[in-house]
Protein backbone atom coordinates (compact mmCIF):
# COMPACT_ATOMS: atom_id res chain seq x y z
CA UNK A 1 0.00 0.00 0.00
CA UNK A 2 1.90 3.09 1.19
CA UNK A 3 2.74 5.37 -1.67
CA UNK A 4 2.03 3.23 -4.70
CA UNK A 5 -0.56 5.79 -5.78
CA UNK A 6 2.15 8.41 -6.01
CA UNK A 7 4.12 6.43 -8.54
CA UNK A 8 1.14 6.47 -10.87
CA UNK A 9 0.39 10.14 -10.45
CA UNK A 10 0.18 12.31 -13.51
CA UNK A 11 3.13 14.59 -13.97
CA UNK A 12 1.18 17.15 -15.90
CA UNK A 13 2.74 20.24 -14.41
CA UNK A 14 1.00 23.55 -14.81
CA UNK A 15 3.28 26.59 -14.66
CA UNK A 16 1.46 28.35 -11.89
CA UNK A 17 3.19 29.07 -8.62
CA UNK A 18 0.28 30.59 -6.79
CA UNK A 19 -1.28 29.93 -3.41
CA UNK A 20 -2.91 26.69 -2.41
CA UNK A 21 -6.28 26.27 -4.09
CA UNK A 22 -9.26 26.80 -1.83
CA UNK A 23 -10.63 23.56 -0.49
CA UNK A 24 -14.16 22.65 -1.53
CA UNK A 25 -17.05 23.88 0.61
CA UNK A 26 -17.43 22.04 3.90
CA UNK A 27 -20.02 19.38 4.40
CA UNK A 28 -22.77 19.94 6.91
CA UNK A 29 -20.98 20.03 10.26
CA UNK A 30 -20.30 22.21 13.22
CA UNK A 31 -16.57 21.92 12.95
CA UNK A 32 -15.77 25.09 14.82
CA UNK A 33 -17.90 24.04 17.77
CA UNK A 34 -15.94 20.82 17.99
CA UNK A 35 -12.48 22.37 17.85
CA UNK A 36 -10.18 21.95 20.78
CA UNK A 37 -9.52 25.24 22.50
CA UNK A 38 -5.87 24.93 21.53
CA UNK A 39 -6.44 22.22 19.06
CA UNK A 40 -3.90 22.71 16.31
CA UNK A 41 -0.37 21.48 16.24
CA UNK A 42 1.87 24.43 17.03
CA UNK A 43 3.88 26.13 14.31
CA UNK A 44 7.24 24.45 13.90
CA UNK A 45 10.08 26.77 13.09
CA UNK A 46 12.34 24.81 10.78
CA UNK A 47 15.56 26.34 12.01
CA UNK A 48 15.48 26.70 15.75
CA UNK A 49 19.08 27.87 16.03
CA UNK A 50 20.47 30.89 17.80
CA UNK A 51 20.30 32.79 14.54
CA UNK A 52 17.06 31.84 12.82
CA UNK A 53 18.09 33.53 9.59
CA UNK A 54 21.35 31.63 9.38
CA UNK A 55 20.06 28.60 7.49
CA UNK A 56 17.58 28.26 4.68
CA UNK A 57 15.62 25.54 2.97
CA UNK A 58 13.95 26.14 -0.39
CA UNK A 59 10.23 25.44 -0.89
CA UNK A 60 9.15 25.14 -4.52
CA UNK A 61 5.51 25.18 -5.54
CA UNK A 62 4.17 23.33 -8.52
CA UNK A 63 0.68 22.59 -9.70
CA UNK A 64 -0.47 19.30 -11.15
CA UNK A 65 -3.35 16.91 -11.48
CA UNK A 66 -3.27 13.84 -9.25
CA UNK A 67 -4.42 10.44 -10.36
CA UNK A 68 -5.61 7.22 -8.79
CA UNK A 69 -5.46 4.45 -11.34
CA UNK A 70 -7.43 5.64 -14.38
CA UNK A 71 -9.07 8.49 -12.46
CA UNK A 72 -7.79 12.06 -12.46
CA UNK A 73 -8.53 14.97 -10.16
CA UNK A 74 -11.14 17.37 -11.44
CA UNK A 75 -8.89 20.29 -10.48
CA UNK A 76 -5.15 20.55 -10.14
CA UNK A 77 -3.58 20.73 -6.72
CA UNK A 78 -0.68 22.93 -5.75
CA UNK A 79 2.12 21.00 -4.11
CA UNK A 80 5.23 22.02 -2.27
CA UNK A 81 8.57 20.35 -2.94
CA UNK A 82 11.46 20.72 -0.55
CA UNK A 83 14.50 21.37 -2.65
CA UNK A 84 18.21 21.30 -2.26
CA UNK A 85 20.82 21.43 0.42
CA UNK A 86 20.33 23.39 3.61
CA UNK A 87 22.85 26.13 4.05
CA UNK A 88 23.36 29.74 5.05
CA UNK A 89 20.54 31.76 3.53
CA UNK A 90 22.88 34.20 1.84
CA UNK A 91 24.53 31.41 -0.16
CA UNK A 92 21.41 29.64 -1.34
CA UNK A 93 20.41 30.41 -4.94
CA UNK A 94 17.03 31.94 -5.60
CA UNK A 95 16.17 29.48 -8.31
CA UNK A 96 17.19 26.06 -9.48
CA UNK A 97 20.51 26.04 -11.30
CA UNK A 98 21.77 29.39 -10.11
CA UNK A 99 24.54 30.03 -7.64
CA UNK A 100 26.65 27.57 -5.70
CA UNK A 101 25.43 25.06 -3.20
CA UNK A 102 26.83 25.39 0.29
CA UNK A 103 27.98 22.09 1.70
CA UNK A 104 28.80 21.92 5.39
CA UNK A 105 32.13 20.30 6.21
CA UNK A 106 30.62 18.67 9.30
CA UNK A 107 27.17 17.09 9.54
CA UNK A 108 25.03 16.91 6.43
CA UNK A 109 21.88 19.04 6.50
CA UNK A 110 19.05 18.17 4.16
CA UNK A 111 15.86 19.96 3.21
CA UNK A 112 12.93 17.60 3.72
CA UNK A 113 9.16 17.82 4.36
CA UNK A 114 8.23 19.02 7.82
CA UNK A 115 4.45 19.34 7.84
CA UNK A 116 1.81 17.80 5.64
CA UNK A 117 -1.76 18.79 5.00
CA UNK A 118 -4.81 17.04 3.64
CA UNK A 119 -6.71 18.38 0.67
CA UNK A 120 -9.97 16.96 -0.59
CA UNK A 121 -9.93 16.03 -4.25
CA UNK A 122 -12.63 14.68 -6.49
CA UNK A 123 -11.37 12.19 -9.05
CA UNK A 124 -13.14 11.81 -12.36
CA UNK A 125 -13.00 8.37 -13.92
CA UNK A 126 -13.32 7.31 -17.56
CA UNK A 127 -16.08 5.24 -19.08
CA UNK A 128 -18.88 6.72 -17.03
CA UNK A 129 -17.52 5.26 -13.79
CA UNK A 130 -18.60 6.99 -10.60
CA UNK A 131 -16.33 9.79 -9.40
CA UNK A 132 -14.20 9.17 -6.33
CA UNK A 133 -13.44 11.39 -3.38
CA UNK A 134 -10.04 11.20 -1.73
CA UNK A 135 -7.95 13.22 0.66
CA UNK A 136 -4.46 13.70 -0.72
CA UNK A 137 -1.44 14.23 1.50
CA UNK A 138 0.51 17.30 0.43
CA UNK A 139 3.67 18.84 1.82
CA UNK A 140 2.85 22.02 3.72
CA UNK A 141 6.31 23.09 4.83
CA UNK A 142 9.95 22.07 4.74
CA UNK A 143 12.75 21.95 7.27
CA UNK A 144 16.42 21.15 7.63
CA UNK A 145 17.35 17.85 9.20
CA UNK A 146 20.82 16.90 10.25
CA UNK A 147 22.44 13.68 9.13
CA UNK A 148 25.51 12.90 11.21
CA UNK A 149 28.05 10.16 10.65
CA UNK A 150 26.34 8.24 13.43
CA UNK A 151 23.01 8.13 11.64
CA UNK A 152 21.98 6.70 8.33
CA UNK A 153 19.61 8.46 6.00
CA UNK A 154 16.52 6.96 7.57
CA UNK A 155 17.48 8.46 10.91
CA UNK A 156 17.61 12.12 10.01
CA UNK A 157 17.84 14.34 13.06
CA UNK A 158 15.82 17.47 13.54
CA UNK A 159 17.90 20.56 12.99
CA UNK A 160 17.34 22.21 16.31
CA UNK A 161 15.44 21.00 19.33
CA UNK A 162 11.77 20.26 18.95
CA UNK A 163 10.00 20.45 22.27
CA UNK A 164 7.55 17.81 23.37
CA UNK A 165 3.97 18.75 22.55
CA UNK A 166 1.85 18.11 25.62
CA UNK A 167 -0.92 20.27 24.14
CA UNK A 168 -1.31 21.08 20.49
CA UNK A 169 -1.37 24.82 20.03
CA UNK A 170 -3.66 26.38 17.44
CA UNK A 171 -2.04 26.41 14.09
CA UNK A 172 -3.00 28.24 10.89
CA UNK A 173 -4.00 26.31 7.78
CA UNK A 174 -2.62 24.30 6.22
CA UNK A 175 -0.80 22.19 8.78
CA UNK A 176 -0.90 18.43 8.69
CA UNK A 177 1.86 15.93 9.23
CA UNK A 178 2.92 13.35 6.77
CA UNK A 179 4.75 10.19 5.96
CA UNK A 180 8.30 8.96 5.91
CA UNK A 181 7.30 6.80 3.00
CA UNK A 182 7.10 9.90 0.85
CA UNK A 183 10.80 10.45 1.32
CA UNK A 184 11.76 7.58 -0.93
CA UNK A 185 9.44 8.64 -3.71
CA UNK A 186 10.50 12.27 -3.69
CA UNK A 187 14.17 11.63 -3.00
CA UNK A 188 15.24 13.10 -6.33
CA UNK A 189 13.49 16.36 -5.49
CA UNK A 190 15.50 16.86 -2.38
Amino acid sequence: QGWQAFKNDATEIIPELGEYPEPPPELENNKTMNRAENGGRPPHHPFETKDVSEYSCRELHFTRYVTDGQCRSAKPVTELVCSGQCGPARLLPNAIGRGKWWRPSGPDFRCIPDRYRAQRVQLLCPGGAAPRARKVRLVASCKCKRLTRFHNQSELKDFGPEAARPQKGRKPRPRARGAKANQAELENAY
Partner: antibody
Protein backbone atom coordinates in the same frame (compact mmCIF):
# COMPACT_ATOMS: atom_id res chain seq x y z
CA UNK B 1 4.36 -0.67 9.35
CA UNK B 2 2.64 1.49 11.94
CA UNK B 3 2.16 -0.12 15.34
CA UNK B 4 0.27 1.25 18.31
CA UNK B 5 0.71 0.00 21.88
CA UNK B 6 -1.60 1.29 24.58
CA UNK B 7 -1.24 1.51 28.35
CA UNK B 8 -2.77 -1.05 30.67
CA UNK B 9 -6.22 -1.33 32.21
CA UNK B 10 -7.33 1.25 34.77
CA UNK B 11 -9.89 1.28 37.56
CA UNK B 12 -11.14 4.72 38.57
CA UNK B 13 -13.69 6.19 40.94
CA UNK B 14 -16.51 8.43 39.72
CA UNK B 15 -15.38 12.03 39.40
CA UNK B 16 -11.76 11.08 38.82
CA UNK B 17 -9.74 11.43 35.61
CA UNK B 18 -7.97 8.84 33.50
CA UNK B 19 -5.10 9.28 31.08
CA UNK B 20 -4.57 6.59 28.45
CA UNK B 21 -1.37 6.47 26.43
CA UNK B 22 -0.73 5.23 22.90
CA UNK B 23 2.87 4.61 21.87
CA UNK B 24 3.60 4.81 18.14
CA UNK B 25 6.32 2.83 16.41
CA UNK B 26 7.22 2.36 12.76
CA UNK B 27 6.62 6.04 12.10
CA UNK B 28 6.95 9.12 14.23
CA UNK B 29 3.87 10.46 15.94
CA UNK B 30 4.20 13.77 14.13
CA UNK B 31 3.74 11.99 10.80
CA UNK B 32 0.37 10.52 11.70
CA UNK B 33 -3.18 11.53 12.49
CA UNK B 34 -4.25 9.92 15.77
CA UNK B 35 -7.90 9.39 16.65
CA UNK B 36 -9.53 7.97 19.78
CA UNK B 37 -12.52 5.63 19.77
CA UNK B 38 -14.24 3.95 22.69
CA UNK B 39 -16.51 0.96 23.09
CA UNK B 40 -18.65 0.32 26.15
CA UNK B 41 -19.23 -3.34 27.09
CA UNK B 42 -21.64 -4.91 24.60
CA UNK B 43 -22.07 -1.59 22.76
CA UNK B 44 -20.90 -0.06 19.51
CA UNK B 45 -17.93 2.08 18.57
CA UNK B 46 -17.96 5.76 19.48
CA UNK B 47 -15.60 8.35 17.98
CA UNK B 48 -14.20 10.70 20.63
CA UNK B 49 -11.93 12.96 18.62
CA UNK B 50 -8.72 13.21 16.70
CA UNK B 51 -6.35 15.26 14.60
CA UNK B 52 -7.79 16.72 11.40
CA UNK B 53 -5.01 17.25 8.83
CA UNK B 54 -7.18 19.51 6.70
CA UNK B 55 -7.18 22.20 9.35
CA UNK B 56 -4.24 21.06 11.43
CA UNK B 57 -6.41 21.00 14.53
CA UNK B 58 -7.76 18.47 16.97
CA UNK B 59 -11.51 17.99 16.80
CA UNK B 60 -13.46 16.56 19.71
CA UNK B 61 -16.88 14.97 19.42
CA UNK B 62 -19.50 17.29 20.88
CA UNK B 63 -20.43 14.74 23.50
CA UNK B 64 -16.95 14.92 25.03
CA UNK B 65 -16.25 18.63 24.62
CA UNK B 66 -14.80 20.09 27.80
CA UNK B 67 -14.18 16.68 29.34
CA UNK B 68 -11.58 15.17 27.02
CA UNK B 69 -8.08 16.35 26.18
CA UNK B 70 -5.95 14.75 23.49
CA UNK B 71 -2.26 15.51 23.64
CA UNK B 72 0.97 14.19 22.22
CA UNK B 73 4.60 14.03 23.20
CA UNK B 74 6.75 13.88 20.06
CA UNK B 75 9.90 13.21 22.04
CA UNK B 76 8.54 9.79 22.98
CA UNK B 77 6.11 9.32 20.06
CA UNK B 78 3.28 8.87 22.52
CA UNK B 79 -0.27 10.19 22.24
CA UNK B 80 -2.49 10.66 25.27
CA UNK B 81 -6.22 10.85 25.84
CA UNK B 82 -7.37 12.24 29.19
CA UNK B 83 -11.02 12.00 30.21
CA UNK B 84 -12.13 13.84 33.32
CA UNK B 85 -15.20 13.81 35.58
CA UNK B 86 -15.58 10.09 35.04
CA UNK B 87 -18.94 8.41 35.51
CA UNK B 88 -19.97 4.77 35.41
CA UNK B 89 -21.10 5.05 31.79
CA UNK B 90 -17.50 5.89 30.82
CA UNK B 91 -16.58 2.28 31.53
CA UNK B 92 -15.32 1.13 28.15
CA UNK B 93 -12.40 -0.08 26.08
CA UNK B 94 -10.56 2.95 24.69
CA UNK B 95 -8.74 2.58 21.37
CA UNK B 96 -6.28 4.81 19.57
CA UNK B 97 -6.21 4.52 15.79
CA UNK B 98 -4.13 6.11 13.09
CA UNK B 99 -3.77 6.53 9.34
CA UNK B 100 -1.47 4.48 7.14
CA UNK B 101 0.88 7.35 6.25
CA UNK B 102 0.26 6.94 2.53
CA UNK B 103 -0.21 9.36 -0.33
CA UNK B 104 -3.96 9.26 0.24
CA UNK B 105 -5.15 9.90 3.77
CA UNK B 106 -6.85 6.76 5.09
CA UNK B 107 -7.74 7.16 8.71
CA UNK B 108 -8.34 4.38 11.26
CA UNK B 109 -6.07 1.94 9.42
CA UNK B 110 -4.07 0.83 12.43
CA UNK B 111 -5.51 0.27 15.91
CA UNK B 112 -4.06 -0.10 19.36
CA UNK B 113 -4.97 -3.17 21.37
CA UNK B 114 -7.38 -1.18 23.52
CA UNK B 115 -7.32 -0.06 27.14
CA UNK B 116 -10.12 -1.08 29.48
CA UNK B 117 -11.15 1.73 31.81
CA UNK B 118 -13.53 0.72 34.60
CA UNK B 119 -15.30 3.41 36.56
CA UNK B 120 -16.67 2.08 39.81
CA UNK B 121 -17.18 3.31 43.33
CA UNK C 1 -24.87 15.84 15.71
CA UNK C 2 -25.67 13.52 12.84
CA UNK C 3 -26.99 10.03 13.49
CA UNK C 4 -25.67 7.18 11.34
CA UNK C 5 -28.02 4.21 10.96
CA UNK C 6 -27.30 0.56 10.15
CA UNK C 7 -29.40 -2.61 10.19
CA UNK C 8 -29.08 -4.05 13.71
CA UNK C 9 -28.71 -7.61 12.42
CA UNK C 10 -28.60 -9.57 9.19
CA UNK C 11 -28.28 -13.26 8.36
CA UNK C 12 -26.68 -14.80 5.30
CA UNK C 13 -26.17 -18.38 4.20
CA UNK C 14 -22.66 -19.65 3.50
CA UNK C 15 -21.82 -18.78 -0.08
CA UNK C 16 -24.67 -16.27 -0.20
CA UNK C 17 -24.66 -12.53 -0.80
CA UNK C 18 -25.71 -9.82 1.64
CA UNK C 19 -25.63 -6.02 1.56
CA UNK C 20 -25.22 -3.90 4.69
CA UNK C 21 -26.23 -0.25 4.46
CA UNK C 22 -25.30 2.95 6.23
CA UNK C 23 -27.53 6.02 6.22
CA UNK C 24 -27.18 9.55 7.55
CA UNK C 25 -29.79 11.61 9.37
CA UNK C 26 -28.58 14.68 7.48
CA UNK C 27 -29.59 13.32 4.07
CA UNK C 28 -28.05 11.19 1.38
CA UNK C 29 -24.64 9.72 1.97
CA UNK C 30 -22.22 10.83 -0.76
CA UNK C 31 -18.59 10.23 -1.64
CA UNK C 32 -17.84 13.40 0.32
CA UNK C 33 -18.66 11.53 3.52
CA UNK C 34 -15.72 9.20 2.75
CA UNK C 35 -17.56 6.14 4.11
CA UNK C 36 -15.50 3.61 6.06
CA UNK C 37 -16.44 0.04 6.91
CA UNK C 38 -14.96 -1.92 9.82
CA UNK C 39 -15.20 -5.53 10.88
CA UNK C 40 -14.99 -6.45 14.55
CA UNK C 41 -14.92 -9.90 16.06
CA UNK C 42 -15.49 -10.54 19.78
CA UNK C 43 -12.53 -9.58 21.94
CA UNK C 44 -10.66 -7.96 19.06
CA UNK C 45 -9.98 -4.42 17.93
CA UNK C 46 -11.85 -3.29 14.80
CA UNK C 47 -10.26 -3.86 11.40
CA UNK C 48 -10.75 -1.56 8.42
CA UNK C 49 -12.25 -3.22 5.35
CA UNK C 50 -13.15 -0.24 3.16
CA UNK C 51 -12.13 3.42 3.10
CA UNK C 52 -13.41 6.28 0.97
CA UNK C 53 -16.58 4.50 -0.19
CA UNK C 54 -14.97 1.68 -2.17
CA UNK C 55 -11.25 1.52 -1.50
CA UNK C 56 -10.20 -1.93 -0.28
CA UNK C 57 -7.10 -2.62 1.72
CA UNK C 58 -4.39 -5.17 1.20
CA UNK C 59 -5.94 -7.34 3.89
CA UNK C 60 -9.55 -6.99 2.69
CA UNK C 61 -10.89 -10.22 1.17
CA UNK C 62 -12.02 -9.79 -2.44
CA UNK C 63 -15.55 -10.86 -1.52
CA UNK C 64 -16.12 -7.52 0.25
CA UNK C 65 -16.93 -4.41 -1.78
CA UNK C 66 -18.09 -0.91 -0.95
CA UNK C 67 -20.40 1.38 -2.90
CA UNK C 68 -23.18 3.95 -2.67
CA UNK C 69 -26.67 2.62 -3.05
CA UNK C 70 -29.87 4.65 -2.94
CA UNK C 71 -28.46 7.49 -0.88
CA UNK C 72 -26.65 5.18 1.52
CA UNK C 73 -23.20 3.69 1.81
CA UNK C 74 -23.25 -0.05 1.22
CA UNK C 75 -21.00 -2.96 2.04
CA UNK C 76 -21.66 -6.04 -0.09
CA UNK C 77 -20.40 -9.47 0.86
CA UNK C 78 -20.51 -11.94 -2.01
CA UNK C 79 -19.84 -15.56 -1.17
CA UNK C 80 -20.09 -15.36 2.60
CA UNK C 81 -17.76 -17.51 4.65
CA UNK C 82 -18.25 -18.69 8.24
CA UNK C 83 -15.35 -16.45 9.32
CA UNK C 84 -17.28 -13.40 8.10
CA UNK C 85 -19.61 -13.68 11.08
CA UNK C 86 -18.87 -10.49 12.99
CA UNK C 87 -20.07 -7.01 13.85
CA UNK C 88 -19.75 -4.48 11.03
CA UNK C 89 -19.57 -0.73 11.59
CA UNK C 90 -19.71 2.11 9.14
CA UNK C 91 -18.18 5.51 9.80
CA UNK C 92 -18.98 8.79 8.06
CA UNK C 93 -16.82 11.91 7.86
CA UNK C 94 -18.68 15.16 8.48
CA UNK C 95 -15.91 17.59 7.60
CA UNK C 96 -13.31 16.10 9.91
CA UNK C 97 -15.77 15.12 12.61
CA UNK C 98 -16.62 11.42 12.47
CA UNK C 99 -19.72 9.46 13.46
CA UNK C 100 -20.00 5.67 13.72
CA UNK C 101 -23.13 3.76 12.90
CA UNK C 102 -24.66 1.51 15.55
CA UNK C 103 -23.25 -1.61 13.91
CA UNK C 104 -24.74 -4.62 12.13
CA UNK C 105 -24.38 -8.08 13.61
CA UNK C 106 -23.89 -10.42 10.67
CA UNK C 107 -24.68 -14.08 11.22
CA UNK C 108 -23.54 -16.69 8.71
CA UNK C 109 -25.68 -19.82 8.93
Amino acid sequence: EVQLVQSGAEVKKPGASVKVSCKVSGYTLSELSIHWVRQAPGKGLEWMGGFDPEDGETIYAQKFQGRVTMTEDTSTDTAYMELSSLRSEDTAVYYCATDSAGYWYKFFQHWGQGTLVTVSS
Amino acid sequence: QAVVTQEPSLTVSPGGTVTLTCGSSTGAVTIDHYPYWFQQKPGQAPRTLISDTDDKHSWTPARFSGSLLGGKAALTLSGAQPEDEAEYYCLLDYGGSFVFGGGTKLTVL
